[in-house]
C-alpha cells in the first residue's frame, strides 16, 4: 500500500510504503497552468480520501478566486454506486468533468479560453450518505491565460486650445508593448506601458498632441503576435472643429 | 441497456431535403450529448454535428463542410434526436451514425446502427 | 483542424500474435497529461465501437488484449494477441479540438 506525503504546496514530496490501509485526505494539482485564449485547457487534480471503497453520494466542485468562498463555476454530483457524474452547474456552458471522481479524477477541461479566466482555481469533493466527510485543495492550480495583443480602443479626442490627442488600448497576454506611428512622428514612436488598475492585461498608450493631419497608426505587439489599428484626422482649418 | 435507433434515410435528388430522426432509451438522455457521424461508402467516419444538452445550454457545433446546411436538434421529453438536412449533394451520400458521448468527453461510446442517405439523381 | 494519419492502411497478422497500429496527429492532441485521441472497432456490416478512450482507458466490456499508448502527436493501439473476432476496421478519433476528426482506417486481416 502506497501513501503520498503533501506538503503545504501541494506538490509531491514522496511516496512511502506503509502496511497500514488508511489514507489520508490529500489533493494533487500543479502550481499553474498555461494555455492561450481561445484554445483549452485541462485543470488537473486528484485526490486520497481515508474512506476506503467509498459508494455513496458525491459532489465535485470547481471554485475561482479562492478557496472555500469562491464562486463555483463548475458542480457534479454522482449518485450512490454510480460512475457518472451529473452535471448541475457550468459557468457559460465552458466547463467540463474529465476525470472520474470514483477514481478520485477531478480533472476538469476549460474551454473557449478568456483572458478573464486568468486566476486561480480550487476544486473539492464531498461525500454524503453513511460517511460525511469533505476536502478541498487550499492553494488551487492558476491558470495563466496568454493571448496575442487585440487593440480594443483607439480613438481621438479634443484637448485644452484646440489641440488633439489619441488613445490606445490593447489587451494581451504578456500585455503588449504599444507604438505610435504617423505624420511628423517617425515610423514608430515606443509609448509608455501603462496597465490599467484592476485590468492587468489591458495597457493605454496616449499621443498627446497631434500636430498634422493625416492617418495615425497604433501598433500592439508581445511574443506571441502584433495587431494594427488606425485613426485619421483632418481638421477644418479656420474652423474649430475637426473630421476624425 | 443502451439503444439507439436511427431512421429517416432514403433516396433523396440532389438539392433536396431529409430529416433523420434519432430514438433512444436504456439512459438518462438528459445527461449527454448526442452526435451525428457519417461514413460514405467504403469510406472513413466524418463527425458531422453535436448537440450538448440542457446545462450546457444545448450549444450545438457542426463540420465546416456542412455548416448551413445541417440543424441537429433534440427532444428530451422524447429522448431524441433530429438532423435536419437541405440543399443535398451527392457527396453527402453516407450512411449516417446517431453517437451519444460523455458531458466530459467528446468520443462515441454508443453507436446506433445507422441510416443510409442517398443523393442521386 | 487537426488531421489524423493512421499506419499502416492494412495488416496481416496470425492469429495470437501482435497487432500494432498506429495513429499520428498533425498536432499535439495532450493537454496536462490528457491525450485526446480515442480508438474504435468496425467490424464489416457494423456499426462503429469505442474501443480505448482518452489514448490509454479501456472502454467498458472491452478484452484486456486491447490496450492504447501514446502522447502529444504520436499514439499506438495494440492488440497482444489477435483472435478470428479482431479481424475488423481501426479508426482513431481527435477531440482535442473541434472539429473532431477521425483517420482513415486500418483495416486488420488474419495471416
Known amino acids: 500500500f502506497v501513501r503520498t506525503k503533501i506538503d503545504t504546496t501541494e506538490n509531491l514530496l514522496n511516496t512511502e510504503v506503509h502496511s497500514s490501509p488508511a489514507q489520508r485526505w490529500s489533493m494533487q494539482v500543479p502550481p499553474e497552468v498555461s494555455a492561450e485564449a481561445g484554445d483549452a485547457a485541462v485543470l488537473p487534480c486528484t485526490f486520497t480520501h481515508p474512506h476506503r471503497h467509498y459508494d455513496g453520494p458525491l459532489t465535485a466542485i470547481w471554485r475561482a478566486g479562492e478557496p472555500y468562498a469562491g464562486p463555483q463555476v463548475f458542480r457534479c454530483a454522482a449518485a450512490r454506486g454510480s460512475e457518472l457524474c451529473q452535471t448541475a452547474l457550468s459557468l457559460h456552458g465552458r466547463f467540463r468533468l474529465l476525470g472520474n471522481p470514483r477514481r478520485n479524477d477531478l480533472s476538469l477541461r476549460v474551454e473557449r479560453l478568456a483572458l478573464a479566466d486568468d486566476r486561480r482555481y480550487f476544486c473539492r469533493v464531498e461525500f454524503a450518505g453513511d460517511v460525511h466527510d469533505r476536502y478541498e485543495s487550499r492553494h488551487g492550480v492558476r491558470l495563466h491565460v496568454t493571448a496575442a495583443p487585440r487593440i480594443v480602443n483607439i480613438s481621438v479626442l479634443p484637448s485644452p486650445a484646440h489641440a488633439f490627442r489619441a488613445l490606445c488600448t490593447a489587451e494581451g497576454e504578456p500585455p503588449p508593448a504599444l507604438a505610435w506611428s504617423g505624420p511628423a512622428l517617425g515610423n514608430s514612436l515606443a509609448a509608455v506601458r501603462s496597465p490599467r488598475e484592476g485590468h492587468g492585461h489591458l495597457v493605454t498608450a496616449e499621443l498627446p498632441a497631434l500636430t498634422h493631419d493625416g492617418r495615425y497608426t497604433c501598433t500592439a505587439a508581445n511574443s506571441l503576435g502584433r495587431s494594427e489599428a488606425s485613426v485619421y484626422l483632418f481638421r477644418f482649418h479656420g474652423a474649430s472643429g475637426a473630421s476624425t | 441497456e443502451v439503444q439507439i435507433v436511427e431512421s429517416g434515410g432514403g433516396l433523396v435528388q440532389p438539392g433536396g431535403s431529409l430529416r433523420l430522426s434519432c430514438a433512444t432509451s436504456?439512459?438518462?438522455?438528459?445527461?449527454?450529448?448526442m452526435n451525428w457521424v457519417r461514413q460514405a461508402p467504403e469510406k472513413g467516419l466524418e463527425w458531422v454535428a453535436q448537440i450538448r444538452n440542457k446545462i450546457y445550454t444545448y450549444a450545438t457545433f457542426y463540420a465546416e463542410s456542412l455548416e448551413g446546411r445541417v440543424t441537429i436538434s433534440r427532444d428530451d421529453s422524447e429522448s431524441s434526436v433530429y438532423l435536419q438536412m437541405s440543399s443535398l449533394r451527392a457527396e453527402d451520400t453516407a450512411v449516417y451514425y446517431c453517437t451519444r458521448s460523455l458531458t466530459g468527453g467528446d468520443y462515441f461510446d454508443y453507436w446506433g446502427q445507422g441510416t443510409l442517405v442517398t443523393v442521386s439523381s | 483542424d487537426i488531421v489524423l494519419t493512421q499506419s499502416p492502411d492494412s495488416l496481416a497478422v496470425s492469429l495470437g500474435e501482435r497487432a500494432t497500429i498506429s495513429c499520428r496527429a498533425s498536432?499535439?492532441?495532450?493537454?496536462?497529461?490528457?491525450?485526446?485521441i480515442h480508438w474504435y472497432q468496425q467490424k464489416p456490416g457494423q456499426q462503429p465501437r469505442l474501443l480505448i478512450y482518452?489514448?490509454?482507458n479501456l472502454a467498458s466490456g472491452i478484452p484486456a488484449r486491447f490496450s492504447g499508448s501514446g502522447s502529444g502527436t504520436d499514439f499506438t493501439l495494440t492488440i497482444s494477441s489477435l483472435q478470428a473476432e479482431d479481424v475488423a476496421t481501426y479508426f482513431c478519433q481527435q477531440s482535442r479540438k473541434s472539429p473532431w476528426t477521425f483517420a482513415g482506417g486500418t483495416k486488420v486481416e488474419i495471416k
Open positions: 498536432q499535439s492532441v495532450t493537454i496536462s497529461g490528457y491525450s485526446f
Open positions: 482518452r489514448a490509454s
Open positions: 436504456g439512459f438518462n438522455f438528459n445527461d449527454y450529448f
